[in-house]
């Protein structure tokens, strides 16, 4: 069974009075429609809340929105709708909040039918004041901030124009027409695709990929016959139509599109897709869809160039382009990812990797759980995690898995214990070691959030009935205490806490319903008085990540190094605090063959760690092309796994082979590239 609620934790005494003094109710003077909430800046305490209410009339829709602002983490709100002239804000564009702590906010307004362009409201002082700006175009997308300079904005118009502002939306300039997709790259570079023959859809596979590094003064065509493109880490990817047929292949560039190499990945047909699941500066996880409407594909992991790929996981669940995948980066522990596979019998199972896709295994069965009806053997089964796919299937799963980089090792997720994911009502499970071991944390579905870098976990039961109770744990979910935050239960709609899990405040959102009206209401609870003192050295203990066998000399080694962390003791009731920085100590490991992947033209036979040469590359779909032209490729058969820091130990040295191979792709040989200026 799950840990007891109000079990004698010996943790927080007299907490009811402490929490009652720190519980703040705010009733919004609104009819219930929809509500959206955004945090402005980091550690500023500023929250913007936009409520909208639609009344469909006979000929048109009447809409009303209200804007509220809090500067104390949601304890108090002020109606600031007058700052935006009581204008109706379009919720589909959300609130565009600037990067980092810029304090910038852009709201896109609804305008009447015949207007020349759209309208935005801009703030650069954390929403204290707004400036109304009429646009020379109707926006199709939310304003996109340059990650490097929050004064630079990008937007697409409904007429497929690419518009840029250099002064935070004050003035706009159309820098290109016929644009399908645009993205900011690094150093204020803009990448975008254009069509020539009428529309994005009609030209799919015949688009051009362009780049501007000076906000539209000059341009360079960096790709032709483009189907789509994407950015991940330091990699620029383009899927490119083949000359001969309707298949397409991935090409990759690490120099902003100046030179391209063909990725050693299978080509895909019209009905298939590629998807970048995750990317960093070292490598990329790429999903390649299987032919036919199977709902699954294969995950490949790249080398440091993004060119050579190793098969990582077969039968990876991914429903359709832009559809559902359960692929989740466990941010609380390096190298850990969780996803789902579709097994031969069409059941869905969860898999986990601890070494960045090198090996995948099932999740260990929680010690305090029994195998359910899906298990053939009642003593042997696994934990299966509910994520995006389960949510899309309308199972009783209110939240996806949760992890935070500053709450080391903690992963919280809904799941079931058996041979596959069950459609029965799930329970909530927690891991404190990044997914190696699991414990049932709460019975039944819950909303949950992490506060104070893991010092507090808060949960609310998912129920169709009104609720008035919140649960909290100061022991990483090992035991729970309950607090009644209001006498009058509310229909719960969501938990909100500041992104980054450093806050001690949690807001409970919902609505009250009476005979005639329903109103939005929020309760913000500050846990600061529960954790009365700041944590000291004695409150932390040392933990070795990825430890599986202390008798193994290289225990804890993942990607060539091990890391020890200072972690809060489960018995300590204290504040990590807003300035808490994870203390970790890395130590380098000796190299083994596991630290290398097989280079182009080599493969690993099953259950063997050595890379062997593919016999004359026969029968392998391995067209190889560097920089768009025929190249000499020299290799010793091994390549260090991206991000691997091992030293010494095994150093696989091979006779260097010359794998000179005809480059079969005519994509973007340098002479095809052209530049032009506005």
């Amino acid at each position: 069974s799950a840990p007891g609620e109000d079990e004698e934790c010996g943790r927080v005494r007299d907490f009811v009075a402490k929490l009652a003094n720190n519980t703040h109710q705010h009733v919004f003077d609104d009819l219930r429609g929809s509500v959206s909430l955004s945090w402005v800046g980091d550690s500023t305490g500023v929250i913007l809340v936009l409520t909208t209410f639609h009344v469909p009339l006979v000929i048109m829709t009447f809409g009303q929105s209200k804007l509220y602002r809090s500067e104390d983490y949601g304890k108090n709100f002020k109606d600031i709708t007058d700052l935006i002239n009581n204008t109706f804000i379009r919720t589909e564009f959300g609130m565009a909040i600037g990067p980092e702590n810029s304090g910038k906010v852009v709201l896109t307004a609804e305008v009447s039918g015949g207007s020349r362009g759209g309208r935005i409201f801009r703030s650069s002082d954390f929403a204290k004041n707004f400036v109304q700006t009429d646009l020379p175009f109707h926006p199709l997308t939310q304003m996109m901030y340059s990650p490097q300079n929050s004064d630079y904005l990008l937007a697409l118009s409904t007429e497929n124009g690419l518009w840029v502002s250099k002064n935070f939306g004050g003035k706009w300039e159309e820098i290109h027409k016929a644009v399908c997709l645009a993205k900011w790259g690094s150093d204020n570079t803009i990448f975008f695709t254009t069509y020539a023959n009428g529309s994005c859809k009609a030209d799919l596979g015949a688009l051009e990929l362009w780049r501007t590094s000076d906000l539209g003064k000059s341009f360079k065509t960096i790709g032709v016959k483009i189907y789509s493109f994407g950015l991940g880490g330091r990699f620029l990817f383009a899927s490119v139509m083949a000359d001969k047929d309707t298949t397409r292949r991935i090409h990759v560039s690490t120099d902003q599109g100046d030179t391209w190499s063909m990725a050693q990945l299978p080509s895909v047909g019209q009905e298939q897709f590629y998807s970048i699941l995750a990317a960093n500066d070292d490598m990329v996880f790429m999903h390649v869809d299987e032919p036919g409407d199977t709902g699954f594909g294969t995950i490949f992991t790249s080398d440091d160039r993004g060119i050579v790929y190793s098969k990582s996981l077969d039968r990876h669940l991914y429903t359709t382009t832009g559809g559902e995948t359960d692929f989740t980066n466990v941010t609380s522990l390096r190298g850990v990812y969780i996803t789902s596979v579709l097994s031969e019998d069409n059941s869905i199972q969860t898999m986990i990797t601890f070494d960045q896709g090198g090996r995948w295994t099932h999740l260990r069965k929680p010690e305090n759980s029994e195998c359910d009806a899906t298990a053939k053997n009642k003593n042997e089964c696994s934990l299966h995690i509910h994520a995006s796919y389960s949510i899309s299937q309308k199972l009783n799963v209110p939240m996806a898995p949760l992890s935070e980089p500053n709450a080391v090792g903690i992963v919280i997720a809904h799941g079931s214990v058996g041979d596959a994911i069950s459609v029965m009502v799930p329970d909530v499970y927690i891991s404190d070691d990044g997914g190696y071991s699991w414990t049932k944390m709460l019975e039944g579905p819950h909303y949950y959030t992490i506060l104070d870098s893991g010092g507090i976990i808060v949960a609310i039961e998912h129920s169709s009935r009104p609720i008035n109770v919140i649960k909290f744990s100061t022991a990483e979910g090992q035991c729970w205490q309950t607090y009644t935050f209001t006498r009058d239960p509310i229909y719960f709609t969501g938990l909100a806490s500041e992104p980054g899990a450093r806050s001690m405040n949690i807001s409970i959102w919902g609505f009250t319903e009476s005979f005639l009206t329903s109103q939005w209401v929020s309760y913000t609870i500050d846990f600061k008085d529960i954790l009365e003192r700041n944590c000291e050295e004695k409150d932390y203990t040392i933990w070795l990540a990825h430890s599986t066998d202390p008798e193994d000399y290289e225990d804890g080694c993942i990607l060539g190094y091990k890391e020890q962390f200072l972690r809060l003791r489960k018995s300590s009731v204290c504040q990590n605090g807003r300035d808490y920085v994870v203390t970790k100590q890395p130590s380098i490991c000796l190299c083994s063959l596991e630290d290398f992947l097989c280079d182009f033209g080599y493969y690993r036979p099953e259950n063997d760690s050595k890379c062997v040469e593919q016999p004359e590359l026969k029968g392998h779909d391995l067209e190889f092309c560097l920089y768009g032209r025929e190249e000499h490729l020299t290799t010793n058969g091994y390549r260090k796994i991206p991000g691997d820091k091992c030293q010494g130990g095994v150093n696989p040295v091979r006779e260097v082979k010359d794998l000179k191979k005809k480059c079969t792709s005519n994509f973007l040989s340098p002479e095809k590239q052209n530049s032009k200026s506005n």
Epitope: G409, Y436, K538, I542, S547, E551, R569, S571, S572
Partner: antibody, heavy 124, light 106 residues
């Protein structure tokens, strides 16, 4: 089989220091924390502190903070405990013990291997 | 630091008796508790870790239970070799031991 062998008995004058060694054999010394525990004649067990050889992370009981230094030498699989400003109350048997480990937590699973003990007598 | 209170401090029993020793923590330590046996002139020996897990090689007549603040060591049928002093030890704060329980022949 893992063994911890400690240095021999010591007789020390008040105000001086003592350094006791603890050499591990037959196991992966670097992957376990080593704790130091003392037992005064006829008294109970008292934890002084511990060290993790990888990274040399040491921590100490509040009572001994500033007076005890625990170190480890990975190359010789040896841990050391130095106690300074000795007084007569420090007369005790000093044990080193390996902290058992089933997970990444170094100190949570009890001390599964103990040294034979080193008697330290503080007398003027 | 977390205090550990062991009771009783001395216990007289006969071979074959069921013996129970309790240990109370000054605050919750979850299940992070170990039990040791020590005989005169010898180093302690680990019996139980994580409150209820039996260390390998330890006879099954020894068992541990409890979580939070209350813990128990039980010897189901006392054997001649079991007359010794027993210590509990918490591991979720800076390590502290209980005062010990001496099990002597009645």
């Amino acid at each position: 089989q893992v063994q911890l062998v400690q240095s021999g008995a010591e007789v020390k004058k008040p105000g001086s220091s003592v350094k006791v060694s603890c050499k591990a054999s037959g196991g992966t010394f670097r992957n376990y924390a080593i704790s130091w525990v003392r037992q005064a004649p006829g008294q109970g067990l008292e934890w002084m502190g511990g060290i993790i050889p990888i990274g040399g992370w040491a921590n100490y009981a509040q009572k001994f903070q500033g007076r005890v230094t625990i170190t480890a030498d990975e190359s010789t699989s040896t841990a050391y405990m130095e106690l300074s400003s000795l007084r007569s109350e420090d007369t005790a048997v000093y044990y080193c013990a390996r902290q058992g480990r089933k997970t990444g937590y170094y100190y949570y699973y009890g001390m599964d291997v103990w040294g034979q003990g080193t008697t330290v007598t503080v007398s003027s | 630091d977390i205090q550990m209170t062991q009771s009783p401090s001395t216990l007289s029993a006969s071979v074959g008796d069921r013996v129970t020793i309790t240990c109370r923590a000054s605050q919750s330590i979850s299940s992070w508790l170990a039990w040791y046996q020590q005989k005169p002139g010898k180093a302690p020996k680990l019996l139980i870790y994580k409150a209820s897990s039996l260390e390998s090689g330890v006879p099954s007549r020894f068992s541990g239970s409890g979580s939070g603040t209350e813990f128990t060591l039980t010897i189901s049928s006392l054997q001649p070799d079991d007359f010794a002093t027993y210590y509990c030890q918490q591991a979720d704060g800076h390590i502290t031991f209980g005062g010990g329980t001496k099990v002597e022949i009645k």
